[in-house]
Interface confidence: medium
Amino acid sequence: FERTRSLQDPCSNCPAGTFCDNNRNQICSPCPPNSFSSAGGQRTCDICRQCKGVFRTRKECSSTSNAECDCTPGFHCLGAGCSMCEQDCKQGQELTKKGCKDCCFGTFNDQKRGICRPWTNCSLDGKSVLVNGTKERDVVCGPSPADLSPGASSVTPPAPAREPGHSPQ
């Protein structure tokens, strides 16, 4: 089958990194600089992606694969294949049309990207607020009052670490 296909279409023999040159009796010609073909049998090569401005080259273009971009410091990738770069904000902020704005009271953002999200409503689970929320951090919910027996600590202390080779006293 392969032999039949190549007899019917000489271009199927052209490997990645080349194009099938119709002007030259369908010989395989190497892709021009700044272009690539990632599959065999192509009639043209594709223009390499240029990582310019806020885009930074993560992987150089080769004759068989496109360039890959990421974003310069202070920006992060958005979209498939880092099609856009969006400005970073500080934790406790979100990006708006007017730039980075602090999270409103009752919301937080613990990343440099994304939007401010509402604090967890502990009471919905019948729990109480153990640690108050901030612009950068969500609230920490404590156990529900029913879980607390008189004199019980609201936070369970961690178990002491056991050293290897030592049995408990």
């Epitope: 194009f19 040159d21 272009s35």
Partner: nanobody, 122 residues
Amino acid sequence: EVQLLESGGGLVQPGGSLRLSCAASGFTLSAEDVGWVRQAPGKGLEWVSAILDSGGSTYYAESVKGRFTISRDNAKNTLYLQMSSLRAEDTAVYYCARVVYHAGGGVTYDYRGQGTQVTVSS
């Protein structure tokens, strides 16, 4: 009609120099991405050097970096390839080529001249 006429090839000893010229007609060199491809005996075509982005950047194959220099004279509509420290493996027919950008986004290239033979031998 687009025409590319190469000249300047010849027989040279290893370590020697040559300057190839490509006189273009039918289009303006300065407005195009142009360069040099070569074909060694029994081998396929290889890109040697190019001027891209209307002169904004140059490309050199790894095998010729530091030895070959591409340039052009816009007034004469001529492309040059200065070749120095020539080696036996540089022996090939050298063609002037124009990169062609297609409407669908594809890229190919066109070379119309007969090429100029460069032979490096002692």
